[in-house]
Interface confidence: low
């Protein structure tokens, strides 16, 4: 037999938060355990789930699990079924809601002297106890002009009036927690004497020495005051108005007129009326002076046809917002077609090249009228007038590549030179018709140019083939001067270049036969061995049949190259004595000699009284200090070549000489004594 | 085949910064300019910036000072830094290619449309609230 082990029990359970409804039964065999509730099976929800054979509840709900529970153990090989006592939950709960009139039927039928019943739709249970308040402030039950009935969690103000307006909220508790009213009621009971306004003043905006008028009317019983201030709290009257408001005018029925306004009018005026009870009523308005400002200037336009595009005007600042329309020709643009106006836009679809002109942007409010033009071009696309040719430059000279384009708006010609972008330098030069002017034609020059113009349209482009005509010249030029070592072979090279190949040939300047020993071999000159009578001026003659020829002269000297008889030698002195440093070269040209001190010509002219360069060539330096050492070169040149040769110098303080050395001894170094 | 592919879009706090980045694929990236342009819902596109194949930086006046476009080739990738963003920069970003032969100072100012330039890629949306 299934026995309950555990059976659920009715228990109290608070709304939201956890319950368990606990079951436990003991079977000789396997059973299955499920709940009902109010007979029907209960399915696991994520709130409300079996946990083991209890039922669990995450979140208790006053509506849900309201009913009766009961827990079924069946056995199902059997058939054999059990079922738990009856169990349920007294759920303790409350709700929020407004205050709500009750009594009379609508806010329109409340009158001074009537009664007035307002419910608070707060719920619970167990049933809660209400707390009314009046604009925050507790009412408690008995005072006078009202009842408060807990049962009905009603109040009533009998009879109710001007004292009771206010805002009505309600506040229950119980034993679950407290609630307060989600909603609030506002009670306005008039009281015939307090002031209410009829006619309230608006804010105003009028241009300079304009008129502007504020109306203000309040009504009571009696009638109420009615007194006009100005932004300074100074009062307005017909019989006492502050200087600055000289033209202000007050109306028996409350409207405030203000002439010729100036800017010193403009702020806030205020219109305070006061009835014989209660609060004074004070409505504000402001007195605006219209005012516009300048409007930005537009950029001009670029446009292809065929396009749509939109030009928007960005209105001035002004006050009031200036209202913005568009021109063109003279003529206010319509809201629809195809050139049109769409808000503050300018619109043109489906552009056409007849669109091109000049639009206008018009401003304007109670301050005045402002106007901004726009200059719309229409890009066509850029025609030929004259295309590159393929042309033949001559070199060093010059050239010149058209490309000649016509097209709105002017186009833009870029030069590209094997696919490279030309940039302009000292070289080439685009001017403004699109002409590329190459300033010195080089041999290289000759390849291909395209050239490219271009508007927003769009673009076309050519390309022509540039064949540089070389100039006749020697490549390079031979030098003016040269000279040749005696008793030496020598050789004298002279090539050129030209549209033709050249043939090239040498001959003495006087017109005589080169000697026997002396050969020309494709231009260049070879002596066997130099002898003196091979020194002379000698010509390079290049020639091919369409440039003619070109000479080139050269003046051959013939010498003796130079050598050193005495050269400088490593010299170590003594501080204060004399150092000779010797150098003595022959050549011919009989070669001069130099010398080099530490990094520098020693010019003979400014060497001072310590140093002198004999005719030999020799160097002396007198009273040497330390600051002499270093390196010195001898340097011997002639009008053929230079030639030269160094040796180190040192300066040392000398020895105090030790008993050990005898006398005589040598000093550890070559040292030059004086 | 030819594919512009924008990344680096979401969300920011106005004051903030973004860095959008388009990487371009099947053309020759160098010989083309770049451009940069947004669409705000039921707006137009808007074009905000340009750096051309030499490049030559342009920008549109709502962006001046605040946005700055650079490119690098080796990556052929373009870059849009956004800072000092607004809620009014709320948009869907678009990368555009350009082969054409009109300078692309004309072509900033005149010309809207998705017609007016030769690739796009698919947008990344950038969201700025206060």
């Known amino acids: 037999a299934i026995v309950f082990i555990k059976q659920p029990s009715s228990q109290d359970a608070l709304q939201g938060r956890r319950a368990l409804l606990r079951c436990e039964v003991e079977a000789p065999g396997p059973v299955h355990v499920y709940w009902l509730l109010d007979g029907a099976p209960v399915q696991d929800t994520e709130r409300r789930f079996a946990q083991g054979s209890s039922l669990s509840f995450a979140a208790v709900d006053r509506l849900q699990d309201s009913g009766t529970f009961q827990c079924v153990a069946r056995d199902d090989v059997t058939g054999e079924e059990a079922r738990s006592a009856n169990a349920s939950f007294n759920i303790k709960w409350i709700e929020a809601g407004p205050v709500v009139l009750k009594h009379p039927a609508s806010e329109a039928e409340i009158q001074p002297q009537t009664q007035v019943t307002l419910r608070c739709h707060i719920d619970g249970h167990p049933r809660p106890t209400y707390q009314w308040f009046r604009d925050g402030t507790p009412l408690s039950d008995g005072q006078s002009n009202h009842t408060v009935s807990s049962k009905e969690r009603n109040l009533t103000l009998r009879p109710a009036g001007p004292e009771h307006s206010g805002l009505y909220s309600c506040c229950a508790h119980s034993a679950f927690g407290q609630a307060c009213s989600s909603q609030n009621f506002t009670l306005s009971i008039a009281d015939e004497s307090f002031a209410r306004v009829v006619l309230a003043p608006q804010d105003v905006v009028v241009a300079r020495y304009e008129e502007a008028m504020f109306h203000c009317q309040f009504s009571a019983q009696p009638p109420p005051s009615l007194q006009w201030l100005f932004e300074d709290e100074t009062p307005i009257t017909n019989r006492s108005r502050p200087p600055h408001l000289r033209r202000a005018t007050v109306f028996a029925n409350g409207s405030l007129l203000l002439t010729q306004v100036r800017p010193r009018n403009a702020g806030i005026y205020r219109c305070i009326g006061q009835g014989q009870r209660g609060p004074p009523i004070i409505l504000e308005a402001t007195l605006h002076l219209a005012e516009i400002e300048d409007m930005p200037l537009f950029e001009p336009r670029v446009f292809t046809a065929g396009s749509e595009e939109r030009v928007t005007c960005l209105p001035p600042k002004g006050l009031p917002e200036p209202s913005v329309w568009w021109e063109h020709a003279g003529v206010r643009l319509p809201t629809h077609g195809r050139v049109y106006q769409k808000g503050h836009e300018l619109v043109l679809a489906n552009i056409a090249e007849s669109d091109a002109g000049v639009y206008t942007c018009h401003a304007a409010n109670l301050a005045g009228q402002r106007r901004q033009d726009v200059n719309i071009t229409v890009a066509t696309v850029p025609s030929w007038l004259k295309k590159p040719q393929d042309s033949q430059l001559e070199e060093g000279k010059p050239g010149y590549l058209d490309c000649l384009t016509q097209a709105t708006p002017k186009p833009t010609v870029v030069w590209y030179r094997n696919q490279m972008l030309i940039s302009e330098d000292s070289r080439f030069e685009v001017f403004k018709n699109g002409t590329l002017r190459i300033n010195s034609v080089e041999v290289y020059d000759g390849t291909w140019y395209r050239c490219m113009s271009s508007t927003p349209a769009g673009s076309i482009e050519a390309q022509a083939r540039v064949q540089v005509l070389e100039k006749l010249k020697f490549t390079p030029p031979p030098q003016p001067q040269q000279c040749m070592e005696f008793d030496k072979e020598a050789t004298v090279p002279c090539s050129a270049t030209g549209r033709e190949k050249p043939t090239i040939k040498w001959e003495r300047a006087d017109g005589s036969s080169l000697p026997e020993w002396v050969t020309d071999n494709a231009g260049t000159l070879h002596f066997a061995r130099v002898t003196r009578d091979d020194a002379g001026n000698y010509t390079c003659i290049a020639s091919n049949g369409p440039q003619g020829q070109i000479r080139a002269h050269v003046q051959l000297t013939v010498a003796v190259f130079i050598t050193f008889k005495v050269e400088p030698e490593r010299t170590t002195v003594y501080q204060g004595h004399t150092a000779l440093l010797q150098c003595e070269a022959q050549g011919d040209p009989k070669p001069l000699i130099q010398w080099k001190g530490k990094d520098r010509i020693l010019d003979p002219t400014k060497l001072g009284p310590r140093m002198h360069i004999f005719q030999n060539g020799s160097l002396v330096i007198h009273d040497v200090a330390p600051e002499d050492s270093g390196r010195y070169t001898c340097i011997a040149g002639n009008s053929c070549n230079i030639k030269h040769t160094e040796a180190p110098l040192y300066v040392v303080d000398k020895p105090v000489p030790e008993e050990s050395e005898g006398p005589g001894s040598p000093p550890p170094y070559k040292m030059i004594q004086t | 085949q030819v594919q512009l592919q924008e990344s680096g879009g979401g969300s920011v706090q106005a004051g903030g910064s973004l860095r959008l980045s388009c990487t371009a694929s099947?053309?020759?990236?160098?010989?083309?300019?770049m451009v940069w342009y947004r669409q705000a819902p039921g707006n137009e596109y808007e074009w905000l910036s340009t750096?051309?194949?030499?490049?030559?930086?342009y920008y549109a006046d709502s962006v001046k000072g605040r946005f700055t476009i650079s490119r690098d080739n080796a990556k052929n990738t373009v870059y849009l830094n956004m800072s000092r963003v607004k809620p009014e920069d709320t948009a869907v970003y678009y990368c555009?290619?350009?082969?054409?032969?009109?300078?692309?100072?004309?072509?900033?100012?005149?010309?809207?449309?998705?017609?007016?330039?030769?690739?796009w890629g698919q947008g990344t949306q950038v969201t700025v609230s206060s």
């Open positions: 555009a290619a350009d082969l054409r032969s009109v300078p692309s100072t004309y072509r900033a100012r005149t010309c809207r449309g998705r017609y007016c330039r030769d690739y």
């Open positions: 099947g053309f020759t990236f160098d010989d083309y300019d």
């Open positions: 750096v051309s194949r030499g490049g030559n930086l």
